[in-house]
């Protein structure tokens, strides 16, 4: 699956109206300078691929963000505004039902959410040249 056929403006609106606020809430109590992230993505489909990777998959030090409010709203936005996206999620949803773990916010998860904030900001400014 690639994100080429998504309605990017509708996804951007969903981000600005709600997902961004949930990301800020998750990060509350951390300084904006605490994580020195140089994440980037080259265009809107690529940004969404990276957002998909970091929102719904484990990474080193952060087992899962998929149950967080921003993640559920991200999934909803992609399901609504990206044709065919929902069909890619069947196995992942079933696997998630099997793994109901206690939520623990680790420093590594905060770092990962900081990376997500950078990706979303880049998604919202697609015409900016890469640094």
């Amino acid at each position: 699956y690639d994100f080429t056929n998504c309605d990017f403006e509708k996804i951007k609106a969903a981000y600005l109206s709600t997902i961004s606020k949930d990301l800020i809430t998750y990060m509350s109590g951390t300084k904006s300078t605490e994580f020195n992230n140089t994440v980037s993505c080259s265009n809107r489909p690529h940004c969404l691929t990276e957002i998909q990777s970091l929102t719904f998959n484990p990474t080193a030090g952060c087992a899962s963000l998929a149950k967080e409010m921003f993640a559920m709203k991200t999934k909803a936005a992609l399901a609504i505004w990206c044709p065919g996206y929902s069909e890619t999620q069947i196995n992942a949803t079933q696997a998630m039902k099997k793994r109901r773990k206690r939520k623990v916010t680790t420093n590594k998860c905060l770092e990962q959410v900081s990376q997500l904030q950078g990706l979303w900001r880049r998604f919202n400014r697609p015409l900016l040249k890469q640094q």
Partner: nanobody, 117 residues
Framework: DVQLVESGGGVVQPGGSLRLSCAAS????????LYWYRQAPGKQRELIAS???????NYVDSVKGRFTISRDNSKNTLYLQMNSLRPEDTALYYC???????????WGQGTLVTVSS
């Protein structure tokens, strides 16, 4: 599906370096999120480094600053550069490739790293 084969393990002295490789065949490698795991004797397998298709990396604290994960999508290969190795890095190292949409994960067979003087 992706098939994975690791190489580059061996015996090294404390403070030394090794570079592990993980060669992939099959489809899907390009957009998958890739991992290096390790399993030390008598311990559980742990995820130590991850990299997205666009090169965003994450590390556990025990290897951060010493290990570097990278990928070459044109060669379908994942790497782990390991510097300043310590005896506690002795383990079987596995690469893994996870479909970012449905979560299906393919594993390599592992390559053994022994850090000993």
């Amino acid at each position: 599906d992706v098939q994975l084969v690791e190489s580059g393990g061996g015996v090294v002295q404390p403070g030394g370096s090794l570079r592990l490789s993980c060669a992939a065949s099959g489809s899907g490698f390009g957009v998958n999120i890739l991992y290096w795991y390790r399993q030390a004797p008598g311990k559980q397998r742990e995820l130590i480094a991850s990299i997205t298709s666009g090169g965003i990396t994450n590390y556990v604290d025990s290897v951060k600053g010493r290990f570097t994960i990278s990928r070459d999508n044109s060669k379908n290969t994942l790497y782990l550069q390991m510097n300043s190795l310590r005896p506690e890095d002795t383990a079987l190292y596995y690469c893994a490739s996870r479909n970012i949409f449905d979560g299906t994960t393919e594993w390599g067979q592992g390559t053994l790293v022994t850090v000993s003087s």
